[in-house]
């Protein structure tokens, strides 16, 4: 039997500078696409290789992005949500979530807390 | 391993129409924006259409009105309608994947995508 897997979910502020490309990056979600279920939060789904998010490397696929220069993501269409990164002009500051998958427990050893049994 | 393999090019006569074909493997269609692009001898790669994570489509101005894109989730297909041939459209066309809605261009700009078919040749003559 496999541990528990537990998540650890960390807050950052992360300052961009737009590249010649760009900011380097893609997103799902919002209202009209949920990524996950009962979320309709805006999620990075990849990061462009040499782009700027790549370059500074504190984003990462799978984060939610909560803010982008202090405007809240929360209920926003999928479309409306691109747009604020488009105009968002050439220093951007983003607010985002990291959520950390961690075994808890060894292998074989039901953790504390688990639902199970 | 993702994948994405084009068919249905051919030989077509001007006025003519065909529909191509691409058909992806290793992932499901949701959440991607798939784009048609193509290349003919000498020229560079262009966009010629495209559909959003959302379902939107777009299309590049030589081509509205003749060309339709659409996508079936549950075939893990999506096509490119082509109406009204013209020997200009003759070229190589590809199609090419990419995962959510990039945040600097639209999905008509080839260097957002990170996964590529190996093209399927459309000639008008």
């Known amino acids: 039997m496999n541990g528990r897997v537990d998540y650890l979910v960390t807050e950052e502020e992360i300052n961009l500078t737009r590249g010649p490309s760009g900011l380097g990056f893609n997103i799902v979600g919002g209202t009209d696409q949920q990524y996950v279920s009962n979320d309709s939060g805006i999620y990075v789904s990849r990061i462009k290789e040499n782009g700027a998010a790549a370059l500074d490397g504190r984003l990462q696929e799978g984060d939610k992005i909560l803010s982008v220069n202090g405007q809240d993501l929360k209920n926003l269409l999928h479309q409306d949500a691109v747009d604020l990164f488009r105009n968002a002009g050439y220093a951007v500051s983003l607010r985002v979530q990291h959520r950390l998958q961690v075994q808890n427990g060894p292998i074989g050893h039901r953790g504390e807390g688990d639902p199970s049994g | 391993q993702v994948q994405l393999v084009e068919s249905g090019g051919g030989l077509v006569q001007p006025g003519g129409s065909v529909r191509v074909s691409c058909v992806s493997s290793?992932?499901?269609?949701?959440?991607?924006?798939i784009g048609w692009f193509r290349q003919a001898p000498g020229k560079e790669r262009e966009g010629v259409s495209c559909?959003?994570?959302?379902?939107?489509?777009y299309y590049v101005d030589s081509v509205k009105g003749r060309f339709t894109i659409s996508r079936d989730n549950a075939k893990n297909t999506v096509y490119l309608q082509m109406n009204s041939l013209k020997p200009e459209d003759t070229a190589v066309y590809y199609c090419?994947?990419?995962?959510?809605?990039?945040?600097?261009?639209?999905?008509?700009?080839?260097?957002?995508?990170?996964?590529w078919g190996q093209g399927t040749q459309v000639t008008v003559s």
């Open positions: 290793g992932f499901i269609l949701d959440y991607y924006a």
């Open positions: 090419a994947a990419d995962f959510g809605s990039s945040v600097d261009s639209t999905c008509l700009n080839n260097q957002q995508y990170g996964y």
């Open positions: 559909i959003d994570s959302v379902g939107r489509a």
